[in-house]
Interface confidence: medium
C-alpha cells in the first residue's frame, strides 16, 4: 500500500496537492472518498489528487482480504 | 476497548431543552468522527446526526427531523461530545446512543440515555 | 434519502435450522473506493445494537462463523447457517453509502 501511494504521490510536485493525496489515503469508512473530496475547498487540482489516492488506497485494502483495519479515522 | 458512556437523560416537557453527554474511553478521540442515533420505544434505531473530527473541519450534520433544533458538539480535551436538545416534541422521546467506528469495524454503540418528553 | 427494505419482518425458526434475512437498498452501495457501505446489526433484547456484518461480507471479530453476509450493489443477504436460542434479536442492515445514513425497518428472529 505504502509503495503505491509514493507511486501516485510522486506524480504531484507541488507540497500542497501531494499533501491533499496523503489526507485521502487516511482511512475513513463514516465517509466515501466522494462525500470527503466535496467538502475540498482548496481547489480542483487538489480535489483530483485526493480522489486518486483515496480511491487507491481504498481498493488496495480492500483487495488486501479486508483486514480488520481501524476504519472511520 | 472502546467504551461510550451516555448521561443526560431524563423526563422533559414538550418545548424544553436537554443536553446528554457521552464520554469516550479506549480510542484516541480527536481521531474519530462521533455520531448520535436514537430508538423511539418499539420502533427501529434513526440516525440524528454526527460531528466530524477537527482535521476534517470538525462540521456536523443533522437528520432532517432535528434540524434547527440539536445541536452536537465536541469536546476533544475531555473526550465528550453533547448532543443540545431544543423545542423537544413528544416524537423526540427516545433512548439516545452515543456511536463510533473507532475501534473495530462496524459502529461501537453506547449503552443509551433514555430521553422522555411528556407533559 | 436511501431506503434499505428488509425482508422478512419477522422470522420464526428451530434451533439448527437456517435464517436467511435480505436487505434491498434503493441505491448501490458499492462507492468508487471500491467499499461495500453496508453493515448489519443485531439487537438483543434489552441491549444495544451490535455489529455483525461491514463492508457486505466481512464478519465482525468475534461473530459465530454461522453469520454471514453477501451481495454488492443493492442486494445483501444476511445467513445464519444454524439458528441458536442466543440468536433471538431484531436485525437491521444500515447504510452509510450516503448522508443521512438510513436503516431497514428491522427482521425479528423468534425461536419456534
Known amino acids: 500500500l505504502q509503495e503505491k501511494i509514493e507511486e501516485i504521490a510522486a506524480k504531484y510536485k507541488h507540497l500542497v496537492v501531494k499533501k491533499c493525496c496523503y489526507d485521502g489515503v487516511r482511512i475513513n469508512h463514516d465517509e466515501t472518498c466522494e462525500q470527503r473530496a466535496a467538502r475540498i475547498s482548496v481547489g480542483p487540482r487538489c480535489v483530483k489528487a485526493f480522489t486518486e489516492c483515496c480511491v487507491v488506497a481504498s481498493q488496495l485494502r480492500a483487495n488486501n482480504s479486508h483486514k480488520d483495519l481501524q476504519l472511520g479515522r | 476497548e472502546v467504551q461510550l458512556v451516555e448521561s443526560g437523560g431524563g423526563l422533559v416537557q414538550p418545548g424544553g431543552s436537554l443536553k446528554v453527554s457521552c464520554a469516550a474511553s479506549?480510542?484516541?478521540?480527536?481521531?474519530?468522527?462521533m455520531q448520535w442515533v436514537r430508538q423511539a420505544p418499539g420502533k427501529g434505531p434513526e440516525w440524528v446526526g454526527l460531528?466530524?473530527?477537527?482535521?476534517?473541519?470538525?462540521?456536523?450534520e443533522y437528520a432532517a427531523s432535528v434540524k434547527g433544533r440539536f445541536t452536537i458538539s465536541r469536546d476533544d480535551s475531555k473526550s465528550i461530545v453533547y448532543l443540545q436538545m431544543s423545542s423537544l416534541k413528544i416524537e423526540d422521546t427516545a433512548v439516545y446512543y452515543c456511536?463510533?467506528?473507532?475501534?473495530?469495524?462496524?459502529?461501537?454503540w453506547g449503552q443509551g440515555v433514555l430521553v422522555t418528553v411528556s407533559s | 434519502d436511501i431506503v434499505l427494505t428488509q425482508t422478512p419482518l419477522s422470522l420464526a425458526v428451530s434451533p439448527g435450522e437456517p435464517a436467511s434475512i435480505s436487505c434491498r437498498s434503493s441505491q448501490s452501495l458499492l462507492a468508487s473506493d471500491g467499499y461495500t457501505y453496508l453493515d448489519w446489526y443485531l439487537q438483543k433484547p434489552g441491549q444495544s445494537p451490535q455489529i455483525l456484518i461491514y463492508?457486505?461480507?466481512n464478519r465482525a471479530s468475534g461473530v459465530p462463523d454461522r453469520f454471514s453476509g453477501r451481495g454488492s450493489g443493492t442486494d445483501f443477504t444476511l445467513k445464519i447457517t444454524k439458528v441458536e436460542a442466543e440468536d433471538v434479536g431484531v436485525y437491521y442492515c444500515l447504510q452509510h453509502r450516503a448522508l443521512p445514513p438510513t436503516f431497514g425497518q428491522g427482521t425479528k428472529l423468534e425461536i419456534k
Open positions: 456511536v463510533s467506528r473507532a475501534g473495530p469495524p462496524g459502529l461501537t
Open positions: 460531528i466530524r473530527k477537527k482535521v476534517n473541519g470538525g462540521t456536523t
Open positions: 463492508g457486505g461480507s
Open positions: 479506549g480510542f484516541i478521540f480527536s481521531d474519530y468522527y
